[in-house]
């Protein structure tokens, strides 16, 4: 007879990423023995929080903490109840609550304590909700994206670990309210502030990072909105025969568009507002967002921020992937090229709202939008980041690697449960043949 | 009042191919999609593909991309599904459907059905 | 890929309260669609834009959607709604149209 060996013990952990737009929670899992090779944390099971996200309630905190409720009783399901006290629980803000900070600090804070409240009721090891800042979320998105694709270290089959010589990815996440660029870089950092020095596994990464809050799409929008409303009297990236009523009040509240605010406006009034399917406005307009006139550095992105060449290849996620995935998918378009990126941005642009709403069935408003964030992608890539034709071939757009989904959430946990150890592993992997 | 007529049952051999015919009567395909759906016996509804014909636009299912190719002669207010390298599990009752821009282009008009048997 | 997920059977009472659910990842951020197939018959759309009704569908059969789950609800029901019911939604990301697995209602009595 063979003695059936169980399968190792399971860890989990649970990331709630509070977004701008709205939360997700990510439940991560691990055999027990294993915590310290690489791609060996896969995403277990995931849960999208139900309305806005938790800036969203400033004006009632403790439904901020009542909203994540369903999700967390989904927890207690996925995992097994006696790793329930062991199993780390963390929640993580993004730029949504960045702007509620600068903006409203005593209710950012209001809002952190109510969710606070509500995560200590359950039976997880709770460690904490707090905001991220910029360089942490570009940061941990990176780690993600190059621990799953196993870039840091691999298992090889003669039973060593060894450090692949495909080099890392950077990664380029466009959330709602902020974006965030990160790729490894030999070149020292003019700007002290965009430079993140990473002991993995005993190698040293020297990480380039930054993040553009009010560059996330959501913000984006409002702020070409902002500018439709101040400069026309229409709306050159949305399609022509859709109109809506704009409250002011929505979109001058936001401090992302501060500088198109009228110094007296009601902010109760509605405006209506049509689109007019004009492609070439519509790039004026999303080129009015950046700003190239100044730089400090040797070079720079944009808006005078220092930025070394972009090199390697790049993952691109988040909306990045969901635009560009629109474009290819539901459109239909080539978007192979920085060439053909911007002749489907165009072809979106030209699209009249009939057009487009029968391209693509059963939509909401939301739709009319993707015009707006084509061309925004398009010029972030090309003209803000410096992407060529030769540079762009290396960056693919993808939302998951391994079956998990590539954000800071994953690398964030990695970092806080210390599943990356600074140091390599032995120089033989450890097998227990007891 | 607008009515989709789908051509007549069919008996096909594995691996050969079949066309279905659906012709609007009573309108035309002007600001109008259609969708093809299947329904093998006793099972659910499984989307096809589908043809915006005054836009000459496409969509295939993942599933069926490479075998099934959907076509419209708007002059007959036609359109056509084909289905290639048939098997025994595309024997099913194949739906066009209309997409009709006052419903978000959802399926409100629907023909009773094509049926397709496969088998040797 | 997106996926929509239907009860297989609901039984109601005659004259009662029937609520089938459909389940799908922020299903709520999407439009759903109802349709209703009795034996031998073509579907037909009794309800759209999650909660509005076609000309011609009785004022009983309504629609909710929000966070994870969209329902159908049939009140005061009759023998003559005894068919399946089929949600549907449209996956942006694949760029097709997904169908639930269909519920079939039985009305008791």
């Known amino acids: 007879t063979r003695d059936i060996r169980e399968p190792p013990a399971l860890k989990y952990g649970i990331v709630l990423d509070a977004g701008s737009s709205h939360t997700s929670m990510f439940i991560y899992k691990w055999p027990a023995d294993k915590e310290n090779d690489t791609g060996i944390v896969g995403q277990h099971s995931s849960c999208d929080v139900p309305g806005g996200g938790i800036s969203s309630y400033a004006d009632n905190p403790s439904g901020a903490g009542q909203s994540l409720v369903g999700c967390l009783e989904q927890a207690l399901r996925d995992v097994p109840k006696e790793r329930h006290a062991g199993t780390p629980l963390y929640l993580g803000a993004t730029a949504g609550m960045r702007l509620l900070n600068l903006t409203n600090p005593e209710a950012s804070t209001s809002v952190l304590t109510a969710v606070t409240h509500t995560l200590t009721q359950y039976p997880f090891d709770f460690r904490g909700a707090r905001i991220l800042s910029g360089q942490e979320e570009g940061v941990f998105g990176w780690v993600t994206a190059n621990y799953l694709l196993e870039n840091f270290i691999k298992y090889g089959w003669v039973g060593r670990w060894f450090r692949p010589r495909k080099g890392t990815l950077g990664a380029m996440d466009l959330g709602g309210a902020s974006t965030q660029i990160t790729f490894e870089t030999t070149s020292p950092a003019e700007d002290r502030a965009s430079e993140v020095q990473l002991r993995l596994y005993g190698q040293h990464y020297r990480v380039y990072t930054h993040s553009f809050l009010c560059y996330g799409r959501d913000q984006v929008l409002q702020r070409l909105l902002a500018s439709a409303l101040q400069t026309h009297s229409f709306h050159p990236c949305w399609p022509r025969g859709f109109s809506t009523h704009v409250l002011l009040g929505d979109v001058y509240q936001s401090p992302c568009t501060v500088a198109q605010r009228p110094q007296t406006f009601n902010s109760s009034a509605r405006v209506s507002l049509s689109g007019s399917s004009d492609p070439h406005l519509c790039r004026d307009l999303v080129s009015g967002l950046f700003s190239f006139s100044s730089c400090p550095f040797s070079r720079c992105s944009f808006n005078g921020v220092f930025q070394p060449p972009v090199a390697g290849n790049f993952i691109a996620f988040s909306a990045f992937f969901y635009t560009v995935n629109f474009l290819r998918t539901s459109m239909g378009l080539p978007v192979a090229t920085l060439q053909q990126l911007e002749a489907a941005a165009v072809n979106v642009c030209n699209q009249t709202w009939a057009q487009l709403q029968a391209r693509v069935p059963g939509q909401q408003a939301h739709l009319a939008d993707y015009c707006a964030g084509a061309m925004f992608v398009q010029q972030l890539l090309s003209r803000g980041y410096g992407f060529d034709e030769r540079a762009f071939g290396g960056v693919i757009f993808q939302k998951k690697a391994a079956d998990t989904a590539v954000g800071w959430a994953l690398g964030y946990m990695l970092n806080l449960t210390n599943l990356i150890p600074a140091d390599p592993p032995g120089l033989r992997k450890g097998t227990d043949f007891s | 009042q607008v009515q989709l007529v789908q051509s007549g049952a069919e008996v096909k051999k594995p691996g050969s191919s079949v066309k279905v015919s659906c012709k609007a009567s009573?309108?035309?395909?002007?600001?109008?999609?259609v969708s093809w759906v299947r329904q093998a016996p006793g099972q659910g509804l499984e989307w096809m593909g589908r043809?915006?014909?005054?836009?000459?636009?496409?969509r295939y299912a993942q599933k069926f991309q490479g075998r099934v190719t959907i076509t419209a002669d708007e002059s007959t207010s036609t359109a056509y599904m084909e289905l290639s390298s048939l098997r025994s599990e595309d024997t099913a009752v194949y739906y066009c459907?209309?997409?009709?821009?006052?419903?978000?282009?959802?399926?409100?008009?629907w023909d009773q059905g094509t049926l397709v048997t496969v088998s040797s | 890929s997106y996926e929509l997920t239907q009860p297989l059977s609901v039984s109601v009472a005659l004259g009662q309260t029937a609520r089938i659910t459909c389940s799908g990842d922020?299903?709520?951020?999407?439009?759903v669609y109802w349709y209703q197939q009795k034996p031998g018959q073509a579907p037909v759309l009794v309800i759209y834009?999650?909660?509005n009704r076609p000309s011609g569908i009785p004022e009983r059969f309504s629609g909710s959607n929000s966070g994870n789950t969209a329902t159908l609800t049939i009140s005061r029901a009759q023998a003559g709604d005894e068919a399946d019911y089929y949600c549907?939604?449209?996956?942006?990301?694949?760029?097709?149209?997904?169908f639930g697995g269909g519920t079939k209602l039985t009305v008791l009595g």
């Open positions: 549907a939604s449209y996956d942006l990301q694949q760029a097709r149209w997904v």
């Open positions: 459907a209309r997409e009709s821009p006052g419903y978000r282009y959802s399926f409100d008009v």
């Open positions: 043809i915006v014909p005054w836009l000459g636009f496409t």
């Open positions: 834009d999650d909660n």
């Open positions: 922020a299903i709520g951020e999407k439009y």
């Open positions: 009573g309108g035309t395909f002007d600001s109008y999609a």
